[in-house]
């Protein structure tokens, strides 16, 4: 009788656009066939996936998030089938370009600022805000109440993830009016991968390290 | 200066209920996420909840799961861990933390923490 | 979910000594760790997130290092102040798991 075969990965957290991922339906028995499911359909033909060894090996050559499974393999001959229970990947991903919310750009003297920042990112980002360059704290939500024109400024949300090894960022220029101006729209708010602020945050590091502002 | 300040703790029977509460001042309480940690009387630490800044996202450990539910009031500045069908494993000193980071983050204030204890 | 096995349980050193904590987690969690030390009748008290970062007002006596399963705590001529309890934990997402502790006595 075939014994129930199980999939081994050679990396069960890869990280996307950069890790390939090697699948391999254990054990070795003869004169059996191989077959491999994803997300419980019959494995389709793609440029990233390679299959080798008989069919035994699946190959992953650039993961994506979209990538995490579940995988099954089966092996089957002329008297029996069996197969495996699933596998699914977790693969680490992100952070993406956060977005700020909500996105008006101006405010009353006097309202509360309240803006929440989010990014795609596995495992979730470590989030941090600056302001003018300055960090203000660790958190993903930050809360000013009573603004004033003294709180006009570009509010950067920073996001981590040790995981992937990756930063992100975005930058919203804010500006408070005393007048009864209604709030304005988002208009254009900068993003980046690191690259266009990483001079702020390399100048915040000892700051970022050991002077926390609330 | 950052102060968590938890109350409601004392003596309860078991199966019995006990609510728990965490006053916060200091910081901007409402940005934070907020967790709960018990020391047992071993002096082992365990993570006991976790919500988010806007009360949106909660987790449990598995060992308070359907038991206890965490919440909060920001407007109050306030944290909250409803306790019922206490066991005799759930005497510990709690305390309530805030987060660095949310779900990725260490407990980076906490509270001088408040004892319960579940002995019939 | 992720074990913290911490060592040793319990150490003995002088003032001026330097020691050294090490914690293994049961898996990869890169550097979502971190080290608290708790005083007796205190609450825990946070002094290295990211695995080497030290939290604010920390000395820089501490340091911490290590990513994926192993990480260390050292600390450089030891101060009065410093003896307690050290606790490890992984910040790589729900639920947090700590370390069983180690207590870091007066010779």
């Known amino acids: 009788e075939l014994p129930k075969p199980y999939i081994s990965s050679n990396n069960s957290n890869p990280i996307e656009d950069k890790d390939a991922v090697t699948l391999t339906c254990e054990p070795v028995a003869e004169n059996t066939t191989y077959l491999w499911w994803v997300n419980n359909q019959s494995l389709s033909v793609s440029p990233r996936l390679q299959l080798s060894n008989g069919n035994r090996i699946l190959t992953l050559l650039s993961v994506t998030r979209n990538d995490t499974g579940p995988y099954e393999c089966g092996i089957q001959n002329s008297e029996s089938a069996k197969r495996s229970d699933p596998v699914t990947l977790n693969v680490t991903y992100g952070p993406d370009t956060p977005i700020i919310s909500p996105p008006d750009l101006s405010y009353r003297s006097g309202a509360n600022l309240n803006l929440s920042c989010h990014s795609d990112s596995n495992p979730s980002p470590q989030y941090s805000w600056l302001i003018n360059g300055t960090l203000r704290q660790h958190t993903q939500v930050l809360f000013i109440s009573k603004i004033t024109s003294n709180n006009n400024g570009a509010y950067a949300c920073f996001v981590s993830n040790l995981a992937t090894g990756r930063n992100n960022s975005i930058v919203k220029n804010i500006s408070v009016s005393s007048g009864d101006s209604a709030p304005g729209s988002s208009g254009l708010s900068a993003s980046g991968s690191g690259s266009g602020l990483n001079d702020i945050f390399e100048a915040q590091k000892i700051e970022w390290h050991h002077h926390h502002h609330h | 200066e950052v102060q968590l300040v938890e109350s409601g703790g004392g003596l309860v029977k078991p199966g019995g209920s006990l609510k728990l509460s965490c006053a916060a001042s200091?910081?901007?309480?409402?940005?934070?996420?907020m967790s709960w940690v018990r020391q047992t009387p071993e002096k082992r630490l365990e993570w006991v909840a976790f919500i988010s800044s806007y009360g949106g996202r909660t987790y449990y450990a598995d060992t308070v799961k359907g038991r206890f539910t965490i919440s909060r009031d920001n407007a109050k500045n306030t944290l909250y861990l409803q306790m019922s069908s206490l066991k005799s494993e759930d005497t510990a000193m709690f305390y309530c933390?805030?987060?660095?980071?949310?779900?990725?983050?260490?407990?980076?204030?906490w509270g001088q923490g408040t004892l319960v204890t579940v002995s019939a | 979910d992720i074990q913290m096995t911490q060592s040793p349980a319990s150490l003995s050193a002088s003032v001026g000594e330097t020691v050294t904590i090490t914690c293994r987690a049961s898996?990869?969690?890169?550097?979502?760790f971190a080290w608290y030390q708790q005083k007796q009748g205190k609450s825990p008290q946070l002094l290295v997130y990211n695995a080497k970062i030290l939290a604010e007002g920390v000395p820089s006596r501490f340091s911490g290092s290590g990513s994926g399963t192993q990480f260390s705590l050292k600390i450089n001529s030891l101060q009065p102040e410093d003896f307690g309890t050290y606790y490890c934990q992984h910040h790589y997402g729900i639920p947090f798991t700590f370390g069983s502790g180690t207590k870091l006595e007066l010779k």
């Open positions: 933390a805030a987060h660095y980071f949310g779900t990725s983050g260490p407990f980076a204030y």
């Open positions: 898996e990869n969690i890169y550097s979502y």
């Open positions: 200091g910081f901007t309480f409402s940005s934070y996420d």
